[in-house]
Amino acid sequence: MEADKDDTQQILKEHSPDEFIKDEQNKGLIDEITKKNIQLKKEIQKLETELQEATKEFQIKEDIPETKMKFLSVETPENDSQLSNISCSFQVSSKVPYEIQKGQALITFEKEEVAQNVVSMSKHHVQIKDVNLEVTAKPVPLNSGVRFQVYVEVSKMKINVTEIPDTLREDQMRDKLELSFSKSRNGGGEVDRVDYDRQSGSAVITFVEIGVADKILKKKEYPLYINQTCHRVTVSPYTEIHLKKYQIFSGTSKRTVLLTGMEGIQMDEEIVEDLINIHFQRAKNGGGEVDVVKCSLGQPHIAYFEE
């Protein structure tokens, strides 16, 4: 290899000394670029690690309440491919929880400008029975909330099979599943492929024709015979779920104000809520039309904010 290098240099020298100098300069430049490249790669790796950590921080688990769906219309598919899947998407916005501590209250006004005015005045003297109480109005510091689209595709060609017994070798079980699900007497049909996972005892079966999956799914179970023993495997629709347009939002509520400074009050929360309501209804107190008041004098309460 060294001899090769010498040969190359010799050829270059024969051409012209200038060309050789240029080549040496180029070599220096290439070395510099290589070093910079390595440096950038390290930087990318560092940033990717940071990104992964940041992603973990923003992972959330939300209990989304059940929603009643309204069926609007039937669409006539333009082609067969539209029949092979049923698609639907849902817009999900999480409610942002806020814990009202003891001695605090939340007041929501009808108009944003009233809330802003109450906050800018900061100190307010509220008459609670025979006590003139000084409360402080602040913006509500909300945690971040999320908004995303759930895109669901229900296949009309595939089914999920679970509770498959671990009684056969993998290839034999794959064949057995294909054979069983191709039997027309059981509602089956020609199988295109079987993706079997022995560890989880589950499989995804893809049929050649549309309609076979529907027929099988009319029942929750399907008979799978192995050495004269009937095992009842569970069949369910094959769905693919994608999260789209995932957004994290944070901010302060424009119409709701946090009131603090009521720690010493020993009264019924509802009475205090009424008195706060009356006080802040009045324009001379910097208030306006009130939507709702929630007060916490004993146990902390959770209030939920939504867009």
Epitope: L168, R169, Q172, D175, E178, S182, E190, D192, V194, Q228
Partner: antibody, heavy 124, light 112 residues
Framework: QSLEESGGDLVKPGASLTLTCTAS?????????MCWVRQAPGKGLEWIAC????????TYYASWAKGRFTISKTSSTTVTLQMTSLTAADTATYFC?????????????????WGPGTLVTVSS | ALVMTQTPSSVSAAVGGTVTINCQAS??????LAWYQQKPGQPPKLLIY???NLESGVPSRFKGSGSGTEYTLTISDLECDDAATYYC??????????????FGGGTEVVVK
């Protein structure tokens, strides 16, 4: 419905040979295994190998046939058996047979369709 | 490995008589047993599958029975045409081994 074997020949020890089985009147489906069975002159039937006719194309061999014999599905109506390092002991009539699933559950099987056989003679 | 042991290797009986052929599997084959008839120069012909189910077109004189590891083929009202070699065969699926097929050694039936 019928099966026909071809490729049988007189070969020298150590040679290789490929047999072909062609199906007529039906094409392979999930309800079948396509198999090869041989019979030495004046002897009994000996199972060699099977291939699942469904999508997986899983293959199964008799322990003595592993490594030297290869079964393949070359189309929806043909199956081949490749044989290597042949010896005089491999001299036999080679049958192609369809192993059929008889019940709704794939638990009862039977070779319900056979080819007439093709003769393989290994001799120097 | 699955081994099928067939007895006797040869049996003879008169026309109208009955013959019984036995087949023993080396392990439980769950009644997945078939019986075949083979005549010289011909491929085997399936008679019975699932130990006792008659293949279509096969006379009811052929009767299969058994379970577990022990199986029997009974041919009654013997006819000259029944002279042939009979084989038992099974295919076994299991958790610990490949799917396996095996034939018995065969029983030659001679009709006098």
């Amino acid at each position: 419905q019928s099966l026909e074997e071809s490729g049988g020949d007189l070969v020298k020890p150590g040679a290789s040979l490929t047999l072909t089985c062609t199906a007529s009147g039906f094409s392979f489906s999930s309800s079948y295994y396509m198999c090869w069975v041989r019979q030495a002159p004046g002897k009994g039937l000996e199972w060699i190998a099977c291939i699942y006719a469904g999508s997986s194309g899983s293959t199964y061999y008799a322990s003595w046939a592993k490594g030297r014999f290869t079964i393949s599905k070359t189309s929806s109506t043909t199956v081949t058996l490749q044989m290597t390092s042949l010896t005089a002991a491999d001299t036999a009539t080679y049958f192609c047979a369809r192993e059929y699933s008889y019940d709704d559950y794939g638990d009862f099987w039977g070779f319900n369709l056979w080819g007439p056989g093709t003769l393989v003679t290994v001799s120097s | 490995a699955l081994v099928m042991t067939q007895t006797p290797s040869s049996v003879s009986a008169a026309v109208g008589g009955t013959v019984t052929i036995n087949c023993q599997a080396s392990q439980n084959i769950y009644t997945n047993l078939a019986w075949y008839q083979q005549k010289p120069g011909q491929p085997p012909k399936l008679l019975i599958y699932g130990a006792s189910n008659l293949e279509s077109g096969v006379p009811s004189r052929f009767k299969g029975s058994g379970s577990g590891t022990e199986y029997t083929l009974t041919i009654s009202d013997l006819e000259c045409d029944d002279a042939a070699t009979y084989y038992c065969q099974s295919s076994l699926e299991s958790r610990i081994a490949d799917r396996a097929n095996a034939f018995g050694g065969g029983t030659e039936v001679v009709v006098k």
